[in-house]
């Protein structure tokens, strides 16, 4: 196309996560997706200035079909404000990432005492559930409800019906999984809500109750039995 | 039948390298940390390194730190170690560990199947 | 790292007696989510340790009812309550809190 334009970024959900605490030893990748036209250049700044090959042993890598930077086998030494300057005739971007490089000793996963709390609310009524993580190496977090089947809440073999309700993916961000939203409340809804987070250290989970109460003024509806999910 | 089977133990000179596998079979290996352990002959267990179920975070001991490197291939179900720069002081029984898997469990998460181990011999 | 120190190095039984090995942590073991994190492992000669007790006190599949595990934070006890020969080995226990992942320098028991 003749349509001269200026960079710009084209897959900002890439480029929220500024703060990579990374422990010593893991692979970094920072991410600056752009577009323009014509199509721009990228380069790499180490704390405001020009990042060189010599300034890190083993170097490091530049994808420039991915807008990327690779930094492998990380070191205290690698601390610091990464910048990706993206150009062309027409413009110049940036965006900053801040690398952390964490030697303490990883652990499980720890979650925050008391979150997520028991709650209670009437029918038609909304609740959030709160949980908050914390954990050296990045973790996998998950709300799970446990369900009943054939009204049973175990199966044959002793464990429990569960259900995921939400799972870390590549489109939710740290903080939208540490909050569950559960809107115009059902009488099923109510039961054992457990948040999991995992990481390669093991798991850690807090569970929490939600009592669901008749709407003032009405009689407590009789409902049929639901549709369970294995 | 969950297992783990380790491979590539061998004798090996002082200051080379060598690489050991491990097959897993019977689980989903994509969804589980994994941990390589050893033993010295006639000593205890010593922890060596982890890998995360997805390989994007990775611990070593300090012993083994800047000579071993775990990785990982989910494709294959194979966990592997890297070791350069081979000491005696590495000779040992290399176990396979499986480790935490990715959701909720009755039971322990991890570290309830081991391998048979393989053998590797720094020596001149 | 944390450090697991285990007694007694060595244990003598009479079939059909108990047996009790002491672990104890230079750390707590109890973790914010209510659980402790000790596991112990039962190493038979020629082979790969194999996984007795987790979580301080939770008998893992297959393991007879004759084994226990208890203990608070740093201090934790395996039982044997009566000892048979197929009991004999090194029995390890193991911190899985934090890595490094660390073990006691185990407790080899034989049958008198």
């Known amino acids: 196309s003749n349509n001269k334009r200026a960079p710009y970024w084209t897959n900002t959900e890439k480029m929220e996560k500024r703060l990579h605490a990374v422990p010593a030893a893991n692979t970094v990748k920072f991410r600056c997706p752009a577009g323009g036209n014509p199509m721009p250049t990228m380069r790499w700044l180490k704390n405001g200035k020009e990042f060189k090959q010599e300034h890190r042993i083993g170097g490091y890598k530049v994808r420039n079909q991915h807008w990327s930077l690779i930094m492998e086998s990380v070191v205290p030494s690698d601390k610091g404000n990464y910048t990706c300057v993206v150009e062309n005739e027409y413009g110049s971007i940036n965006h900053t990432y801040h690398l952390d490089v964490v030697e303490r000793s990883p652990h499980r996963p720890i979650l925050q005492a008391g979150l997520p709390a028991n709650a209670s609310t009437v029918v038609g009524g909304d609740v959030e559930f709160v949980c908050k993580v914390y954990s050296d190496a990045q973790p996998h977090i998950q709300w799970i409800k446990h369900v009943e089947k054939n009204g049973s809440k175990y199966g044959p073999d002793g464990l429990p019906y569960l259900k995921v309700l939400k799972a870390a993916g590549v489109n939710t961000t740290d903080k939208e999984i540490e909050v569950l939203y559960i809107r115009n409340v059902t009488f099923e809804d109510a039961g054992e809500y457990t948040c999991l987070a995992g990481n390669s250290i093991g798991i850690s989970f807090h569970s929490a109750w939600l009592t669901v109460l008749p709407a003032p003024g009405r009689e407590k509806e009789i409902t049929a039995s639901p549709d369970y999910l294995e | 039948e969950v297992q783990l089977l380790e491979s590539g133990g061998g004798v090996v000179q002082p200051g080379r390298s060598l690489r050991l596998s491990c097959a897993a079979s019977?689980?989903?290996?994509?969804?589980?940390?994994m941990h390589w352990v050893r033993q010295a002959p006639g000593k205890g267990l010593e922890w060596v390194a982890v890998?995360?179920?997805?390989?994007?975070?990775?611990y070593y001991a300090d012993s083994v730190k800047g000579r071993f490197t775990i990785s990982r291939d989910n494709s294959k179900n194979t966990l592997s170690l890297q070791m350069n720069s081979l000491r005696v002081e590495d000779t040992a029984i290399y176990y396979c560990?499986?480790?935490?898997?990715?959701?909720?469990?009755?039971?322990?998460?991890?570290?309830?199947?081991w391998g048979q181990g393989t053998m590797v011999t720094v020596s001149s | 790292d944390i450090v697991m120190t285990q007694t007694p190095l060595s244990l003598s039984v009479t079939p059909g007696q108990p047996a009790s090995i002491s672990c104890t942590s230079s750390?707590?073991?109890?973790?914010?989510?209510?659980?402790?994190?000790l596991y112990w492992y039962l190493q038979k000669p020629g082979q790969p340790p194999q996984l007795l007790i987790y979580?301080?006190?939770n008998r893992f599949s297959g393991v007879p009812d004759r084994f226990s595990g208890s203990g608070s934070r740093t201090d934790f006890t395996l039982k044997i309550s009566r000892v048979e020969a197929e009991d004999v080995g090194v029995y390890y226990c193991?911190?899985?809190?934090?890595?490094?992942?660390?073990f006691g320098g185990g407790t080899k028991v034989e049958i008198k």
């Open positions: 560990v499986r480790g935490a898997g990715r959701g909720y469990t009755y039971g322990p998460d991890g570290f309830d199947i």
């Open positions: 019977g689980f989903t290996f994509s969804s589980y940390a």
């Open positions: 890998i995360s179920y997805d390989g994007s975070n990775k």
């Open positions: 750390r707590s073991l109890l973790h914010s989510d209510g659980k402790t994190y």
């Open positions: 979580e301080l006190s």
């Open positions: 193991m911190q899985y809190i934090e890595a490094p992942l660390t």
